[in-house]
């Protein structure tokens, strides 16, 4: 004969464990079931009743099978230099990420605590490395015969053109000026191509990517001729 | 106010390690690239090692290359430098410097009071 | 790795004399080139940057110049104050050296 199914709440066998998505309660002695995701517990259960469940509030969540009395508050609303990603419902908390030229410079269990600018590369300098989601652009003086004329966070180093005369020849932050008509590229090895990610706290010297400046910040930074731009979002 | 303070420096014998720290407050400790600059008693400063903001590049000068490491925690807001296999000519005052925010703001904008390294049997 | 010459190694002068440091790279370091101040006993302090943009809360006595590989730090008026050591120091590619200082001293 097939064992007998046992309805919540019922006493463990001795040693024995509660089933998926339930719990042992202490004060009752008793696995009871578990509220699942978007509920919490309003009653707990007795020897001879089950687990109460009900809906969370709004701007609250459970993720998980669970038997908390109340249900979690959600984040506060997302920063202005962030864009929600995932929205507060009952199952889920809000999900706050860096908007586009920004980066995660410190990270939270979800989302994000503080979001910074992207560096940006002067003129001379070129992206080495382009920015993620949690890191920085990582800038490098443009080598001999490349250049770059912009301040940005996605330029990277560009080939001087080739002149057949030179009018005024090309530097790290300038190209060639051509009298001709028809100028051409060079192809400089590696100047057209951002090179491959150096392997993490690399030591290297020029020209692999060196550093920069602090990130864009307009408020909360001190002083300092220019410094980084950065924005706190809500715990 | 920025306030940068190193410390762990000292007495060490030739071929020794030691660890400086410094301990960085004031602002957005995770979102600037930082350095040590050395100045040996009575001579002029020198460059000795930069990590960007995110601890993923890495720079050093050649006199140090493969003996120091820089290092930073941006939780805890501190930078350190694990130097090994020290000689003489590493005595110095080290100093904790914010910058350069290389590419973009390339200067040394704050400097910490200077920890004082003594190599010396 | 890119050398800088500074000059000169000291100087004197009285309170009110014009004074002039130089600096020059032995490659173009395209401006990207601080000065900085030291004073006995004391941390360096950015004076310029970029060459030419002074440092928030720094006199307007003080000026940077230059491009390319020839630099130079000018200080108008000089005042008691401004008795110290300077450095020049470049940001272009690895290692970022300094210039051997500028000890300006009282005559």
């Known amino acids: 004969l097939p064992a007998q199914v046992a309805f919540t709440p019922y006493a463990p066998e001795p040693g024995g464990t509660c089933r998926l998505r339930e719990y042992y309660d202490q004060t009752a002695q008793m696995c009871c079931s578990k509220c699942p995701p978007g509920q919490h517990a309003k009653v707990f259960c007795t020897k001879t009743s089950d687990t109460v469940c009900d809906s969370c509030e709004d701007s609250t969540y459970t993720q998980l099978w669970n038997w908390v009395p109340e249900c979690l508050s959600c984040g506060s609303r997302c920063s202005s230099d962030q864009v929600e990603t995932q929205a507060c419902t009952r199952e889920q908390n809000r999900i706050c990420t860096c908007r586009p030229g920004w980066y995660c410079a410190l990270s939270k269990q979800e989302g994000c605590r503080l979001c910074a600018q992207l560096r940006k590369c002067r003129p001379g300098f070129g992206v080495a490395r382009p920015g993620t989601e949690t890191s920085d652009v990582v800038c490098k003086p443009c080598a001999p015969g490349t250049f770059s004329n912009t301040t940005s966070s996605t330029d990277i180093c560009r080939p001087h053109q080739i002149c057949h005369v030179v009018a005024i020849p090309g530097n790290a932050s300038m190209d060639a000026v051509c009298t001709s008509t028809s100028p051409t590229r060079s192809m400089a090895p590696g100047a057209v191509h951002l090179p491959q990610p150096v392997s993490t706290r690399s030591q290297h010297t020029q020209p692999t990517p060196a550093p920069s400046t602090a990130p864009g910040t307009s408020f909360l930074l001190p002083v300092g001729p220019s410094p980084p731009a950065e924005g706190s979002t809500g715990d | 106010e920025v306030q940068l303070v190193e410390s762990g420096g000292g007495l060490v014998q030739p071929g020794g390690s030691l660890r400086l720290s410094c301990a960085a407050s004031?602002?957005?400790?995770?979102?600037?690239?930082l350095s040590w600059v050395r100045q040996a008693p009575g001579k002029g400063l020198e460059w000795v090692a930069y990590?960007?903001?995110?601890?993923?590049?890495?720079y050093y000068s050649d006199t140090v290359k493969g003996r120091f490491t820089i290092s930073r925690d941006n939780a805890k807001n501190s930078l350190y430098l694990q130097m090994n296999s020290l000689r003489a000519e590493d005595t110095a005052v080290y100093y904790c410097?914010?910058?350069?925010?290389?590419?973009?703001?390339?200067?040394?904008?704050?400097w910490g009071q200077g920890t004082l390294v003594t190599v010396s049997s | 790795d890119i050398q800088m010459t500074q000059s000169p190694s000291s100087l004197s002068a009285s309170v009110g004399d014009r004074v002039t440091i130089t600096c020059r790279t032995s490659e173009s370091i395209y401006s990207n080139l601080p000065w900085y101040q030291q004073k006995p006993g004391k941390s360096p302090k950015l004076l310029v940057y970029d060459a030419t943009k002074l440092a928030e809360g720094v006199p307007s006595r003080f000026s940077g110049s230059g491009s390319g590989t020839d630099y130079t730090l000018t200080i108008s008026s000089l005042q008691p104050e401004d008795f110290a050591t300077y450095y020049c120091q470049h940001f272009w590619v690895t290692p970022w050296t300094f210039g051997q200082g500028t000890k300006v001293e009282i005559k």
């Open positions: 990590i960007n903001n995110g601890g993923i590049s890495t």
């Open positions: 410097v914010r910058g350069p925010f290389y590419g973009s703001a390339n200067y040394f904008d704050y």
């Open positions: 004031g602002f957005a400790f995770s979102t600037y690239d």
